[in-house]
């Protein structure tokens, strides 16, 4: 649900702060980065949309990327821009809208939303359909014909959650984003009430699974409100969650 996407990501093992902008209510991943928010402009009207400053693509919504608003503009002044549709020019995968990736400077359709298709295509061009190996170690010859037709498994690099198999989401790990398991009932999550207060986060948990939301654990009382343990819990039928 929207609420669980908003609230259920937890980060740990932080390195020393490295800077970064504050969270953006419309972003897929916060500027920290680490907290998933509802995706991009689709929850905002054009009238109230305001350019959001960013440093990296993942600080923007799923339908946005981070760049200077003017061609050849100051790289220090970047904002979240609308993603580019098929056949539009691009420089990296995140510039292309979901379901596409950047190949040879143009946004092209991904196979099964697999945004790394460029690598597999390179292999097909180089080796054709011959999947034999010379010494058992010509590892690039079979750069995963199976991966090309399936979504990312646990630990696979991803750009968006749609790149991952069912039950997984795309979340930050170190300096990349990988497919990780969606949280199950009882698993720890972190509910960030104040956006932009979480510092730089490089280990990110998925959101809570279907029918679950990130809520404070009952009978877990601590002096500090901010340090209370949150877990993925079943929705109460009589209880509804709303955004603030």
């Amino acid at each position: 649900t929207l609420n669980s996407v908003l609230n259920s990501n937890a980060i740990k093992n932080l390195p020393p702060p490295l800077g970064g902008a504050a969270g953006h209510p419309g972003s897929a991943v916060s500027a920290a980065p680490g907290i998933l928010y509802p995706g991009g402009n689709k929850y905002q009207t054009i009238d109230n949309y305001q350019p959001y400053p960013c440093a990296e693509d993942e600080e923007c919504g799923t339908d946005e990327y981070c760049a200077s608003p003017t061609r050849g503009g100051d790289a220090g002044v970047q904002i979240c821009l609308a993603c580019r549709k098929r056949r539009k020019r691009c420089m990296r995968h995140a510039m292309c809208c979901p379901g596409n990736y950047c190949k040879n400077g143009i946004c092209v359709s991904s196979d099964q939303n697999h945004f790394r298709g460029e690598i597999e295509e390179t292999i097909t061009e180089s080796f054709g359909n011959d999947h034999s190996t010379l010494d058992g170690y010509s590892r690039r010859t079979t750069l995963s014909s199976k991966m090309y037709h399936t979504k990312g498994q646990e630990g696979s690099v991803c750009l968006r959650s749609s790149d991952c198999a069912s039950g997984l989401c795309c979340a930050r790990h170190f300096w990349s984003k990988i497919c990780k398991p969606v949280l199950k009932e009882g698993q720890v999550c972190t509910k960030h009430r104040r956006k932009g207060s979480h510092g730089l986060e490089i280990f990110q948990r998925c959101y809570c699974g279907e029918g679950l939301s990130c809520r404070i654990q009952k009978d877990h009382h601590q002096a500090s409100n901010s340090s209370r343990l949150h877990t993925c819990q079943r929705h109460h039928h009589h209880h509804h969650h709303h955004h603030h």
Partner: antibody, heavy 117, light 111 residues
Framework: EVQLVESGGGLVQPGGSLRLSCAAS????????ISWVRQAPGKGLEWVAS???????YYPDSVKGRFTISRDNAKNSLYLQMNSLRAEDTAVYYC???????????WGQGTTVTVSS | EIVLTQSPATLSLSPGERATLSCRAS??????????MNWYQQKPGQAPRLLIY???KQGSGIPARFSGSGSGTDFTLTISSLEPEDFAVYYC?????????FGGGTKVEIK
């Protein structure tokens, strides 16, 4: 074909500086994080620095303040500026990236840095 | 930081034999439902090559004779039947925490 080619290694005196380069090809360079990993003669592997696709940088304490990792996405190039070099920085320096999974799944062949007087 | 200890330091075996390499972490490398343990092979004068990631998943194009297992702090790399090209040094690496760290290596040599 994915390729990473390092250059810039050489002999330098303690306290000196050196700039390593890594030329990447065969993938959309600007979309991926990339790292430097080193290996001292006869020793194991040690992570040196990483930079995300968006340019955020990460270092271990052993090189923080002395080494600077950077990237030029327009040139498909990665750099490592090494200052205040010490004898213990002597190693083969590899650039490595993570294209398919979170591990270092593609490596260059390395460039040798020797710090000696 | 997480310290990885590999054993044995050297393993002397003949082609066709089974090799079992061990890696022990100073603390659990499991998180987010994944064991963040990787294995690499390195031959003299060459760069490391990824064999196994997430404890048991094979890297691209890696022969089926290489398999990984384990969780928490104890991990194993198994080569079911050694080929002549398998004699090399093998490193484990954890990616649960910054800094990512490597084990000291196990050399698999011809008996």
């Amino acid at each position: 074909e994915v390729q990473l080619v390092e250059s810039g290694g050489g002999l330098v005196q303690p306290g000196g500086s050196l700039r390593l380069s890594c030329a990447a090809s065969g993938f959309t360079f600007s979309s991926y994080a990339i790292s430097w990993v080193r290996q001292a003669p006869g020793k194991g592997l040690e992570w040196v620095a990483s930079v995300s696709g968006g340019g955020r940088t990460y270092y271990p304490d052993s090189v923080k303040g002395r080494f600077t990792i950077s990237r030029d996405n327009a040139k498909n190039s990665l750099y490592l500026q090494m200052n205040s070099l010490r004898a213990e920085d002597t190693a083969v320096y590899y650039c490595a990236t993570s294209l398919e999974n979170y591990a270092f799944d593609y490596w260059g062949q390395g460039t040798t840095v020797t710090v000696s007087s | 930081e997480i310290v990885l200890t590999q054993s044995p330091a050297t393993l002397s075996l003949s082609p066709g034999e089974r090799a079992t390499l061990s890696c022990r972490a100073s603390e659990s490398v499991d998180d987010f439902g994944i064991s963040f343990m990787n294995w690499y092979q390195q031959k003299p004068g060459q760069a490391p090559r990824l064999l196994i990631y997430a404890a048991s998943k094979q890297g691209s194009g890696i022969p089926a004779r290489f398999s990984g297992s384990g969780s928490g702090t104890d991990f194993t790399l198994t080569i079911s039947s050694l080929e002549p090209e398998d004699f090399a040094v093998y490193y484990c690496q954890q990616a649960k925490e910054v800094p990512p760290t490597f084990g000291g290596g196990t050399k698999v040599e011809i008996k």
